[in-house]
């Protein structure tokens, strides 16, 4: 019987060009975590395997960093990064637990675009 629960950062927002940390935490189970997959929709971002360590998908290697912990850091965010992210915990003997995070990437503040008015 699967007794565990996944806590996530939930719905989060970040500015274009910035960074964000995606975090999930598995609790209320003594099951052993053998692997955590991070996915965006159906695309694999990264794997953290208990034996082999971290793998970052080739297409994300310049913008994704492992950690902290079992989390994932997304860098140089673009509006195209807006969407659902999933942390998939493979555990023994429980099986698979999945957490969901929704990220919204917002256009940067006025500061990035420069002042709109000249101060006399």
């Amino acid at each position: 019987m699967m007794t565990g629960t996944i806590e996530t950062t939930g719905n989060i927002s970040a500015e274009k060009g910035g960074s964000i940390i995606l975090q999930c935490h598995l609790s209320s189970t003594t099951a052993q975590v053998t692997q955590v997959n991070w996915e965006q929709q159906d695309q694999l971002l990264a794997i953290c395997n208990a034996d082999l360590g971290w793998h970052i998908s080739p297409s994300f290697k310049d913008r994704v960093a492992p950690g902290p912990g079992l989390g994932l850091t997304l860098q140089s965010l673009t509006v195209n990064d807006t969407g659902e992210y999933f942390c998939i915990y493979h555990t023994y003997p429980d099986g698979t637990y999945t957490g969901r995070i929704f990220l919204e990437v917002l256009e940067s503040s006025v500061a990035e675009h420069g002042a709109r008015f000249q101060i006399p």
Epitope: N49, D51, L52, G53, W54, H55, I56
Partner: nanobody, 116 residues
């Protein structure tokens, strides 16, 4: 510079099998983990399977679990990918890499086409 040469691809019917080989001019491992990747037309290159240099641990993409088996022979500087129960969606160019994160050396790949 280490050369990687993949071979064993070809045309196979759905449900068929192929065994891919990856021969390296030096060690097949540049770190602790080597992997097989694939790239289908119009898609990003993705991990298929990986294996530790002690061969004690393996990882598989969910889409190939139970069908593909990765192995490595350090004495021959060669890695293998046994592919069974092939599906049309397995059609891609398959590459090996000496590290599953540092993509400095790629071979030319070997084309696998699954079609009836």
């Amino acid at each position: 510079e280490v050369q990687l040469v993949e071979s064993g691809g070809g045309l196979v019917q759905p449900g068929g099998s192929l065994r891919l080989s990856c021969a390296a001019s030096g060690s097949i491992f540049s770190g602790n983990v080597m992997g097989w990747f694939r790239q289908a037309p119009g898609k990003e290159r993705e991990l298929v399977a990986a294996i530790s240099n002690s061969a004690s641990s393996t990882v598989y993409a969910d889409s190939v679990k139970g069908r593909f088996t990765i192995s490595a022979d350090n004495s021959k500087n060669t890695a293998y990918l046994q592919m069974n129960s092939l599906k049309p969606e397995d059609t891609a160019v398959y590459y090996c890499a000496r590290d599953w994160n540092l993509f400095d050396y790629w071979g030319q790949g070997t084309l696998v086409t699954v079609s009836s």
